[in-house]
Amino acid sequence: MASAGMQILGVVLTLLGWVNGLVSCALPMWKVTAFIGNSIVVAQVVWEGLWMSCVVQSTGQMQCKVYDSLLALPQDLQAARALCVIALLVALFGLLVYLAGAKCTTCVEEKDSKARLVLTSGIVFVISGVLTLIPVCWTAHAIIRDFYNPLVAEAQKRELGASLYLGWAASGLLLLGGGLLCCTCPSGGSQGPSHYMARYSTSAPAISRGPSEYPTKNYV
């Protein structure tokens, strides 16, 4: 029962992670313009994402522009896009694998195979978490590096956007959920069936036998 509870918690966490990852990838808030200096009132804020950039005026009006050419984009942005999409697809694959092996489904009947599928889904979710973490950490590193680089002018300096925090949360949830799914499975492949057998034999009705008829190997 505890194992089933952990599985449900694990998959709920990974689903939350997947949604967070999707929002993180989609929102144009990876980089936010950093206006340094206390003597000025900034008229606009620029948000930059993987797919578009947005300008928010002081009036609250927002204008977004989707990046035109794929080939004209910086390589790190192209890589971040690719990793984000791959991470989301990998997590979806992990979910399908989990559903095939979940205790409450009948796709696979054999308990050993079910356990292996849940374990596999956990590993897949962990991989998805790592794939989500790479572009987020890479972008954060680039922002921080440029922020403290004396060669970079203020207009080119950026701050960490909300999408990065969502990305970290998504990665954490996928890693945690995947880890929980890995932990719900028995460590040895053959332990599962013998565990069920032991439970079955203890609950079987006792038959009166002579003392010599009891198999001695059952006693430790």
Epitope: G37, I40, A153, E154
Partner: antibody, heavy 119, light 107 residues
Framework: EVQLQESRPELVKPGASVKISCKTS????????LHWVKQSHGKSLEWIGG????????IYNQKFKGKATLTVDKSSSTAYMELRSLTSEYSAVYYC????????????WGQGTSVTVSS | DIQMTQSSSSFSVSLGDRVTITCKAS??????LAWYQQKPGNAPRLLIS???SLETGTPSRFSGSGSGKDYTLSITSLRTEDAATYYC?????????FGTGTKLELK
């Protein structure tokens, strides 16, 4: 006293390369970025690029990318700018300048090196 | 790139005059502006940064003002040593760009 001492004037043939030096003194070399500025005769100033002597990081004006290469020698507190495949439009005075610590303006300048490209 | 325009390329001025040199940026540079003085045969010298802050050694007769795209350098009671070319420079964005220059000549 902060000083930036640039190398002697250069007369080079078209297509050739030139390497200008800028020897600094009077401050900690690695604490300030160094920049190069071009001034053609009777014209305005043009920023070429800058270098961080601490780690060798560079930034270039797109116009001079592939034309200018900025380097430093920390042991001698000297900055260098190499200009290659020169044409007559690169005949100018080249200044090295130190970036001010709080703003991206140049607070100390070298005396300038005159480069003449002529056959 | 941000273009910096100094509308007057030269001024003919008299000693004691008050002079105002203007500089216009092609976009908002948020006060990230410096003014330089250059005398013939010499390197430029930084006078003002942050649009208004006088550098150490800059005489108090010099002052800077402006915001957004428009900035000015003012010199009250002009002196002989002020005859030079003045350049503005934006450092809001790279590439750093300089104004076209304004030459002050004494009458």
């Amino acid at each position: 006293e902060v000083q930036l001492q640039e190398s002697r004037p250069e007369l080079v043939k078209p297509g050739a390369s030139v390497k200008i030096s800028c020897k600094t003194s009077g401050y900690t070399f690695t604490e300030y970025t160094l920049h190069w500025v071009k001034q053609s005769h009777g014209k305005s100033l043009e920023w070429i690029g800058g270098i961080n002597p601490n780690n060798g990081d560079t930034i270039y004006n797109q116009k001079f990318k592939g034309k200018a290469t900025l380097t430093v020698d920390k042991s001698s507190s000297t900055a260098y700018m190499e200009l290659r495949s020169l044409t007559s439009e690169y005949s100018a005075v080249y200044y090295c300048a130190r970036r001010a610590i709080t703003v991206y303006a140049m607070d100390y300048w070298g005396q300038g090196t005159s480069v003449t490209v002529s056959s | 790139d941000i273009q910096m325009t100094q509308s007057s390329s030269s001024f003919s001025v008299s000693l004691g005059d008050r002079v105002t040199i203007t500089c216009k940026a092609s976009e908002d540079i948020y006060n990230r502006l410096a003014w330089y003085q250059q005398k013939p045969g010499n390197a430029p010298r930084l006078l003002i940064s942050g649009a208004t802050s006088l550098e150490t050694g800059t005489p108090s007769r010099f002052s800077g003002s402006g915001s957004g795209k428009d900035y000015t350098l003012s010199i009250t009671s002009l002196r002989t040593e002020d005859a030079a070319t003045y350049y503005c420079q934006q450092y809001w964005s790279t590439p750093l760009t300089f104004g076209t220059g304004t030459k002050l000549e004494l009458k």
